[in-house]
């Protein structure tokens, strides 16, 4: 390997004479932070992404980079600026000694610095059978729309673009940013270099084994012949896509990221920026049989993160590992023994497994949905993917016990028709990260920018919690759950819905003086109740039992424990109607559920009473689940009686709008 120091020594010598006494001090009170990969073998010390504050211009980025070089040179250090970022994130990529980090963190405009790290390919024909609605036969799989209006970007290995399965469908861009292969005796065999990317391109758009047979693709090489890349190379690839989008705006874009590395703040931030520019990003959850939230880009909330299941809808096992899981996974898709184009020859096929293959399926489905409805936003697309998924088919016993409730039991499927879903009120459940066990710990769950938070609930495995409340944060409602003394921590659970032209607010009633319990209702004209939350300051609510059923004619009312403050989510939207549905069980039971009927969507899920033996409430698809402590510890007293309260809504306005379109 060539010694690169020669050419960057030259660069730095030229800068030694530059006046660097002008360095501005960082803005008062702000401290830039340093981040690095939690997985030691994946770290790449010596290369750093310096991320600058959001409004920093390109010229300022260049100036900051030069200043770093000049200051480093004065201390006798060599540095090399490898890339200046602009378009997605302001900043630069620098090769330098870790000794200079303290200096770099003090530079003007610096927001944070992240050490570079590795990312990896995530791979080790029932697949069309599973994603195809029953009315199609997989052997004659002719999708209603092949995704022809959509361009899918693939960030992966090199690919054999003239393979018979994908010829003419994939444009290989001139983008390449890959690390050297490991090992001195590594032999670059073209067919192996192309293996991962060729297979995935085939899964997305292959003529015979592809999901979206009409989709055109563009490939960027960010993984080397061993399937290894870097966070920085992936960032530069995402920036390339953004610049291409600005130079030549086309129709909808889907970006497939069939790779994973350790949690990366900067990679997640870049994904967020690209998603907010209207690009749909789909990524592999990872093949580490671990919480997907520990990996990037899987942990980026704006990205559609896909886990892998097999022909029997079971989570995929890959050697000693398997698919990742947890709250950062949006849904699962076929990812075991997936047939696709093989780079071994121009007509060869091979089966590969992994969350890369699963992500490719979802990218194909997304391309078809966007081709049918090009105006769909990311939020609308995600909600549709969830809505049309096969529900509750995965055997959750495969997941660690503490992850089962957090992991979506959804397997991606094509909609029976790519049109006509517009009338539906779509909602999804978003779990927060765990709060941690400290007394005042809280957890926050957020909806996507163009979703409405219609209700908020909380859950604690120990039952020690102080409820939840909806509160404004940055001009948007969030769901915050509160831990209690001695609790092991809580989760906040947001119900996030697509409700165009909605005007929602939260009405709060403080703890009641009287023994009747606390009540709050939606008093504004035309506002309907979409969710109820309760929050209390006391450590234990005790056994006070408020009246469970609402007085007749008062459906817009939340009731709760007299020592709790009650929060009602009240919304006004064209044609929105909601009703309360309750299911009470007099005897103690670990789980009580109540579901909304066909045509109605669950927006709110809460428990009555809010006493401490209730672990919490959460929505699973259209069912409200209330969990209580183990009945053996509760006894069969009246304290064990629990009611699950669902609020079910529908939008007549959306239904009419869709009928007018048809």
């Amino acid at each position: 390997q060539e010694d690169e120091d020669g050419d960057y020594e030259e660069l730095v010598l030229a800068l030694r004479s530059e006046e660097d006494g002008l360095a501005e001090a960082p803005e008062h009170g702000t401290t830039a932070t340093f981040h690095r990969c939690a997985k030691d073998p994946w770290r790449l010390p010596g290369t750093y992404v310096v991320v600058l504050k959001e409004e920093t211009h390109l010229s300022q980025s260049e100036r900051t980079a030069r200043r770093l070089q000049a200051q480093a040179a004065r201390r006798g250090y060599l540095t090399k600026i490898l890339h200046v970022f602009h378009g997605l994130l302001p900043g630069f990529l620098v090769k330098m000694s870790g000794d200079l980090l303290e200096l770099a963190l003090k530079l003007p405009h610096v927001d944070y610095i992240e050490e570079d790290s590795s990312v990896f390919a995530q791979s080790i024909p029932w697949n069309l059978e599973r994603i195809t609605p029953p009315r199609y036969r997989a052997d004659e799989y002719q999708p209603p729309d092949g995704g022809s209006l959509v361009e899918v970007y693939l960030l992966d290995t090199s690919i054999q673009s003239d393979h018979r399965e994908i010829e003419g469908r994939v444009m290989v861009t001139d983008f390449e940013n890959v690390p050297e292969e490991d090992g001195t005796r590594f032999h670059r065999q073209a067919s192996k270099c192309d293996s991962h990317g060729t297979h995935l391109a085939g899964v997305v758009s292959g003529r015979d084994a592809g999901v979206a047979k009409g989709a055109s693709m563009r490939s960027l090489r960010v993984l080397n012949c061993q399937g290894k890349g870097t966070v920085s190379g992936t960032l530069i690839g995402l920036e390339f896509i953004r610049k291409s989008q600005l130079v030549q705006p086309v129709g909808p874009l889907v970006v497939l990221l069939p790779l994973a590395g350790g949690y990366s703040r900067v990679l997640n931030a870049a994904c967020q920026r690209l998603a907010r520019a209207g690009v749909v990003l789909v990524t592999a959850a990872g093949n580490f049989r671990d919480d997907a939230c520990l990996y990037s880009p899987a942990s980026a909330p704006e990205v559609i993160t896909v886990g892998a299941t097999n022909a029997q809808d079971q989570p995929v096992t890959l050697g000693t590992l398997g698919t990742n899981f947890g709250r950062c996974v949006d849904l699962f898709a076929p990812g075991e023994d997936i047939i696709g184009a093989s780079s071994d020859c121009s007509t060869c096929f091979v089966s590969q497994s992994g969350t890369s293959q699963a992500a490719a399926h979802v990218a194909g489905i997304a391309a078809m949905m966007l081709s049918a409805e090009p105006e769909l936003t990311l939020a609308e697309l995600r909600q549709r993917l969830i809505h049309f998924s096969a529900k509750d088919v995965i055997n959750e016993a495969w997941f660690p016990e503490d992850q089962r409730v957090l992991t979506p039991n959804l397997v991606a499927a094509l909609p029976p028709s790519t049109h006509g879903a517009g009338w539906q009120l779509f909602c999804r459940t978003v779990w927060s990260a765990h709060s941690g066990p400290t007394r005042m710990a809280t957890a926050v769950a957020r909806c996507a920018p163009d979703e409405e938070l219609l209700s908020c609930s909380s859950f604690s495995r120990s039952g020690k919690r102080r409820g939840e409340r909806m509160e404004a944060q940055g001009g948007k409602l969030v769901c915050r759950a509160h831990n209690a003394f001695g609790g092991e921590g809580v989760y906040a659970i947001a119900r996030c819905c697509l409700l165009p032209q909605a005007n929602c607010s939260v009405h709060t009633a403080p703890p009641a003086e009287a023994s009747m319990g606390t009540r709050v209702h939606c008093h504004q004209q035309g506002h309907v109740l979409t969710g109820c939350s309760s929050h209390w300051e006391v450590e234990d609510l005790g056994t006070h039992k408020p009246p469970v059923l609402r007085p007749r004619g008062q459906p817009n009312q939340c009731v709760g424990h007299r020592e709790a403050s009650i929060h009602a989510s009240c919304c006004h939207a064209p044609g929105l109607e909601c009703k309360v549905k309750e299911h009470g069980i007099p005897a103690p039971q670990e789980q009580v559920t109540v579901a909304c009927e066909e045509g109605w969507t669950l927006t709110g899920c809460s428990a009555l009473p809010g006493t401490s033996h209730v672990l919490g409430a959460y929505a699973v698809d259209n069912t409200c689940v209330v969990r209580s402590r183990d009945v053996s510890t509760t006894g069969s007293t009246s304290e064990g009686a629990v009611t699950a309260v669902a609020i079910c809504c529908r939008s007549r306005h959306l239904a009419q709008a869709s009928q007018e379109l048809q």
Partner: antibody, heavy 115, light 109 residues
């Protein structure tokens, strides 16, 4: 405009070899290979094989039995088909076409094998 | 590979519709979405008319349509015109290669 331009007609003696060229233009070369198809007088079309501009890989029809060699020269955007040990029944019009999909065809090259 | 089976000839009057069949096996026509149809006028190179069973390249009249059922593919030409008189060939993928039909001569009466 996507175009495939083939070399001119050839007259060869039995046992000789012929090399037909096909120059491609107007598209991204590496996205497609080149198929070779021949048509004997008054007969149908016969697929002979395929060659890659991307990596030079080939896929030959069984009938060629090692008599044919297909190559590409990406620097000149040209594909070649060489046929050795010519026989009279190799007399045909030889076409190159873009990829396996054969969506664009060359004008054809007449090869006559006659003693 | 054996050639796909096509009728040697079909004929029709101007304005009529005709259908040309192309029968193969589950290893070619029945096993792939990639059946193509070509038109060839005398002394000219073939021209792609239908690809991937039923798709028309831009510039090809919508009077030409393709379909497939099991191991048989079909080309239908509606509103027959004099310039449609030509030879028509079907083509399919096989596992490792490509196979053509024997060709059908279309005569416009």
């Amino acid at each position: 405009e996507v175009q495939l331009v083939q070399s001119g007609a050839e007259v060869k003696k039995p046992g000789a070899s012929v090399k037909v060229s096909c120059k491609a233009s107007g598209y991204t070369l590496t996205s497609y290979g080149i198929s070779w198809v021949r048509q004997a007088p008054g007969q149908g079309l016969e697929w002979m094989g395929w060659v890659s501009f991307y990596n030079g890989n080939t896929n030959y029809a069984q009938k060629l039995q090692g008599r044919g060699t297909m190559t590409t020269d990406p620097s000149t955007s040209t594909a070649y088909m060489e046929l050795r040990s010519l026989r009279s029944d190799d007399t045909a019009v030889y076409y190159c076409a873009r990829g396996y999909g054969m969506d664009v065809w060359g004008q054809g090259t007449t090869v006559t094998v006659s003693s | 590979e054996s050639a796909l089976t096509q009728p040697a000839s079909v004929s029709g009057s101007p304005g009529q519709s005709i259908t040309i069949s192309c029968t193969g096996t589950s290893s070619d026509v029945g096993g792939y979405n990639s059946v193509s149809w070509y038109q060839q006028h005398p002394g000219k190179a073939p021209k792609l008319m239908i690809y991937e069973v039923s798709n028309r390249p831009s510039g090809v009249s919508n009077r030409f349509s393709g379909s497939k059922s099991g191991n048989t593919a079909s080309l239908t030409i509606s509103g027959l015109q004099a310039e449609d008189e030509a030879d028509y060939y079907c083509n399919s993928y096989t596992s490792t290669s490509m196979v053509f039909g024997g060709g059908t001569k279309l005569t416009v009466l």
